[in-house]
């Protein structure tokens, strides 16, 4: 581990003396002197600082721009930034969630493996043998082929990854 520095945790070194850092939610107005303490002021409305700091300006809260499909997930405070997420049916294009894109739909022959969230896109998977999807959807999983046997029917047309089997009546045995 690094050896301790001349100033304690939550202090900083300026002009040969240790001054207290400003607490989260406050900005530096003036450094301490030999005779005075560090002077800090609370961040204004729509501003924040999330660490012990010596910043002279607070950061602006993130703006969740509805024109980019964004909405507020969690309102910012003087100590935290606003957290944006995407409107229903949309998801963030990056971890910072600066803009949104429409959830991807899974094409016929593919089903939804994982439904999209505000921060992740739809995950599709190809329908395996025995399953199908005949629609383009952001929600539908691959459906199993109909079991003709359980209906006392026979397969008249084989299923594919995009179509269900077609069942029909069994041929009558002639005497």
């Amino acid at each position: 581990p690094e050896p301790p520095t001349a100033c304690r945790e939550k202090q900083y070194l300026i002009n040969s003396q240790c001054c207290s850092l400003c607490q989260p939610g406050q900005k530096l107005v003036s450094d301490c002197t030999e005779f005075t303490e560090t002077e800090c002021l609370p961040c204004g409305e729509s501003e924040f600082l999330d660490t012990w700091n010596r910043e002279t300006h607070c950061h602006q809260h993130k703006y969740c721009d509805p024109n980019l499909g964004l909405r507020v997930q969690q309102k910012g405070t003087s100590e935290t930034d606003t957290i944006c997420t995407c409107e229903e049916g949309w998801h963030c294009t990056s971890e910072a969630c600066e803009s949104c894109v429409l959830h991807r739909s899974c094409s016929p022959g593919f089903g939804v493996k994982q439904i999209a969230t505000g921060v992740s896109d739809t995950i599709c998977e190809p329908c395996p043998v025995g399953f199908f999807s005949n629609v383009s959807s952001a929600f539908e999983k691959c459906h199993p082929w109909t079991s003709c046997e359980t209906k006392d029917l026979v397969v008249q047309q084989a299923g594919t990854n995009k179509t269900d089997v077609v069942c029909g009546p069994q041929d009558r045995l002639r005497a």
């Epitope: 001349a6 100033c7 304690r8 002009n15 040969s16 003396q17 002197t33 030999e34």
Partner: antibody, heavy 116, light 107 residues
């Protein structure tokens, strides 16, 4: 009255070490940082490092971190600087100073001469 | 590291003169500029801290000014005891650095 009394001049051999002392009086020793500097013959001043007598925490000038080691003894209100692996380039006057707003009070300096 | 430049390395003036010594920093040091006096016998004293604040016990004929990267020390009425070398030093960013010094002599 604030005073910093440094140890006397030293004549030392190349490759050896020397420990310079700086005894503080007239103020609360642990309330102020102690700064150390060097002045080579006919040259300006250069900062070596700083120590907090209350915690023992230090910051060094990268240039001197393998040369100088700063310590303090609270019981005697004394700061020390050990200089190691001395060469002729280390021949200089070494100063201690009390922090505050800048180097507020200075010791009288200690001349270290490195010579075979 | 921040470089402090004292362009005048030596200066001659007469007793009673107004003398100005300058110091330029390689970047903004937010007024954390201190001035020291080193007498011929080697003793060093703080004169001015934070650009313009007079250290306790320092005569009022010493004053400092400046901002950003340009700073100066003024002695308004030069006296014999002011014969010394004057150094500037920045306390804004580690490592602390000093100017090369300006040696003041009597004409």
């Amino acid at each position: 009255e604030v005073q910093l009394e440094q140890s006397g001049a030293e004549l030392v051999r190349p490759g050896t070490s020397v420990k310079v002392s700086c005894k503080a009086s007239g103020y609360a020793f642990t309330n102020y940082l102690i700064e150390w500097g060097i002045q080579r013959p006919g040259q300006g001043l250069e900062w070596i490092g700083v120590i907090n007598p209350g915690t023992g925490g230090t910051n060094y000038n990268e240039k001197f971190k393998d040369k100088a080691t700063l310590t303090t003894d609270k019981s005697s209100s004394t700061a020390y600087m050990q200089l190691s692996s001395l060469t002729s380039d280390d021949s200089a006057v070494y100063f201690c100073a009390r922090g505050g707003s800048g180097f507020a009070y200075w010791g009288q300096g200690t001349l270290v001469t490195v010579s075979a | 590291d921040i470089v402090l430049t004292q362009t005048t390395s030596s200066l001659s003036a007469s007793l009673g003169d107004r003398v100005t010594i300058s110091c330029r920093a390689s970047q903004d040091i937010n007024n954390y500029l201190n001035w020291y006096q080193q007498k011929p016998d080697g003793t060093v004293k703080l004169l001015i801290y934070y650009t313009s604040r007079l250290h306790s016990g320092v005569p009022s004929r010493f004053s400092g000014s400046g901002s950003g990267t340009d700073y100066s020390l003024t002695i308004s009425n030069l006296e014999q005891e002011d014969i010394a070398t004057y150094f500037c030093q920045q306390g804004n960013t580690l490592p602390w650095t000093f100017g090369g010094g300006t040696k003041l002599e009597i004409k």
